[in-house]
Structure formats: structure tokens, C-alpha cells
């Protein structure tokens, strides 16, 4: 889980190892702050929980791509 001790900067110190389906993911944000020890992606799930993930992992990149496309596609 993300850690916001030095609010308002949120950092990730550990990444999930588990692959998560895009079915559970609602949105994401990238963590690129120099105040954080590593670059990260924080996924927000459909039940509003936050998960730290490694942006170098393929499933994470695929999930971000999917969410980007979902955002671009207007709902009918």
C-alpha cells in the first residue's frame, strides 16, 4: 500500500508481486517524485483500495494502456 508520511507526497516502498486483472482496476497514477525512493504506479481499485505496482512489469504497462483506452472511449 502507498505511504503518505511526507504528505502531500505519496511514495511506494514495496510493489505487489501479484498480477491483478483490469476488471478490478478503476484508475492509476504515476509516482515520479524525486522525494520517493522509486518510480511507481498506484492503481485504484473498483472498491477504492490503492495498490503499488512496478511500472517496469508488463502486466502493469498493459493495465495502464487498458485504463487509458477506457478513459478515451466515451460510454454509450
Amino acid at each position: 500500500q502507498p505511504d503518505a508520511i511526507n504528505a502531500p507526497v505519496t511514495c511506494c516502498y514495496n510493489f505487489t508481486n501479484r498480477k491483478i486483472s483490469v476488471q478490478r482496476l478503476a484508475s492509476y497514477r504515476r509516482i515520479t517524485s524525486s522525494k520517493c525512493p522509486k518510480e511507481a504506479v498506484i492503481f485504484k481499485t473498483i472498491v477504492a483500495k490503492e495498490i503499488c505496482a512496478d511500472p517496469k512489469q508488463k502486466w502493469v504497462q498493459d493495465s495502464m494502456d487498458h485504463l487509458d483506452k477506457q478513459t478515451q472511449t466515451p460510454k454509450t
Epitope: 498480477k19 491483478i20 476488471q23
Partner: antibody, heavy 119, light 113 residues
Framework: QVQLVQSGAEVKKPGASVKVSCKVS????????MHWVRQAPGKGLEWMGG????????IYAQKFQGRVTMTEDTSTDTAYMELSSLRSEDTAVYYC????????????WGQGTLVTVSS | DIVMTQSPASLAESLGERATINCKSS????????????LVWYQQKLGQPPKLLIY???TRESGVPDRFSGSGSGTDFTLTISSLQAEDVAVYYC?????????FGQGTKVEIK
């Protein structure tokens, strides 16, 4: 493709504990979110618990809290479910179940392990 | 917890007839942002583990015959077998996967009349 192979049938006395194993192949266990579901004879499916990446930890159904422990041996890609203080109502087939990307449902199941609790 | 209630408990239809199973959730399992229902259907044959048939309430898993269809939204869902075959004799379960704890319906046994 994920494959799950469970340990064999067990007969236990009331009050004892049982430990069921589930060996993963095709994936490493740490990539998966392994869960356990049981089914008493002639009854329905009952989720017991499993690793929830949204919480970052193993979560348990309230009914089994304090009596069940789910662990992982990442060196052998084997998941374990230990149930203690067994009673006759715990007689059931116990399944490990998962999917390649955690979604909240299960498309890969072990073959099941029958645990019989009898004096 | 989200409680799942299935009906009927059992049903018997003739070969080639339609079989309909209902599943009701105590809370909505519709996520409005993507308009998807977080509900799956499983088929369990005697002595076997369950097999996933349908996810997102209406999307068939690959390899599942098209006589199986899922419908419904929010709290009320239906699994339909359009033309019952001998190999469809099984118990069918719904499960919500919107939020933990993951909960199942009590099952519907489908037999041939």
C-alpha cells in the same frame, strides 16, 4: 496455464488439525492470489479465505477467523491451508482456487481434498 | 457481506427445453464507472471442481457453448440454457466478485425430466 495439484484425502479426529497442500505449476505462486473454497457433502461452495492483493495480505471469512491459517512456501510454489479444532461439520472437500490475474473469481481449481472428521 | 440467493434449488426440464436459473444479490454488484456487473456463473458436475462459465454477468468464458447465456444487472441475474443437453446435468452457482468476502449462491441442481 495454471495447474493446481492438491494433497490426498485425510481422516481426522474431532479437535485435531489438518493441513492441506496445493502445488502450483505453470506460474510462480507469488504471481497468483491463492484462495481456498470448501464444499460439505451435498452442500454448496463456501469461500474460506485467500491472498487479497487489494489488502496486501491474506484475508479470511469471518466464520473461520482464528481457526484457519493459509500460508505459502515460495521455494516450492506450494500453498497450504491449515484448519484447527476440527469438528464433524468440517467434513468437506477443500479446494484451492485462483486465476492468472486476480479478479475476485476463480478459473483454476485444484482437484479437491476430502477431509473427513470422525471419532 | 453481499448475500447471494439462487432459485430454484432444483429444476428438471426435457432435453432440448430451456432451463432458467435466477440469482439475486443483497446489494448491487454493478460498478457504474464501467457499467459492468461483477457476477460469475459456475457449472459443477458430480465429483469435479467447479468450472467457470460466465463472467461480468454475460460474457461467456472461451470454449463455453453458446446455449449458455447470462443476463441481468444490479441485483437480479439469470443464467439460461437455451436447449438443455444431457451433459448439462450439474449444479450451477452464481458468485459476486464486486467486493470481499467473495460469496456464492447456494446452487441450483439441473436434471433431465
Amino acid at each position: 496455464q495454471v495447474q493446481l495439484v492438491q494433497s490426498g484425502a485425510e481422516v481426522k479426529k474431532p479437535g485435531a488439525s489438518v493441513k492441506v497442500s496445493c502445488k502450483v505449476s505453470g506460474y510462480t505462486l507469488t504471481e497468483l492470489s491463492m484462495h481456498w473454497v470448501r464444499q460439505a457433502p451435498g452442500k454448496g461452495l463456501e469461500w474460506m479465505g485467500g491472498f487479497d492483493p487489494e489488502d496486501g495480505e491474506t484475508i479470511y471469512a469471518q466464520k473461520f477467523q482464528g481457526r484457519v491459517t493459509m500460508t505459502e512456501d515460495t521455494s516450492t510454489d506450494t500453498a497450504y491451508m491449515e484448519l484447527s479444532s476440527l469438528r464433524s461439520e468440517d467434513t468437506a472437500v477443500y479446494y484451492c482456487a485462483t486465476n492468472e490475474f486476480w479478479s475476485g473469481y476463480f478459473d483454476y481449481w485444484g482437484q479437491g481434498t476430502l477431509v473427513t472428521v470422525s471419532s | 457481506d453481499i448475500v447471494m440467493t439462487q432459485s430454484p434449488a432444483s429444476l428438471a426440464e426435457s432435453l432440448g427445453e430451456r432451463a432458467t436459473i435466477n440469482c439475486k444479490s443483497s446489494q448491487s454488484v454493478l460498478y457504474s464507472s464501467n457499467n459492468k456487473n461483477y457476477l460469475v456463473w459456475y457449472q459443477q458436475k458430480l465429483g469435479q471442481p467447479p468450472k467457470l462459465l460466465i463472467y461480468w454477468a454475460s460474457t461467456r468464458e472461451s470454449g463455453v457453448p453458446d446455449r449458455f447465456s447470462g443476463s441481468g444487472s444490479g441485483t437480479d441475474f439469470t443464467l439460461t440454457i437455451s436447449s438443455l443437453q444431457a451433459e448439462d446435468v450439474a449444479v450451477y452457482y452464481c458468485q459476486q466478485y464486486y467486493r470481499s468476502p467473495w460469496t456464492f449462491g447456494q446452487g441450483t441442481k439441473v436434471e433431465i425430466k
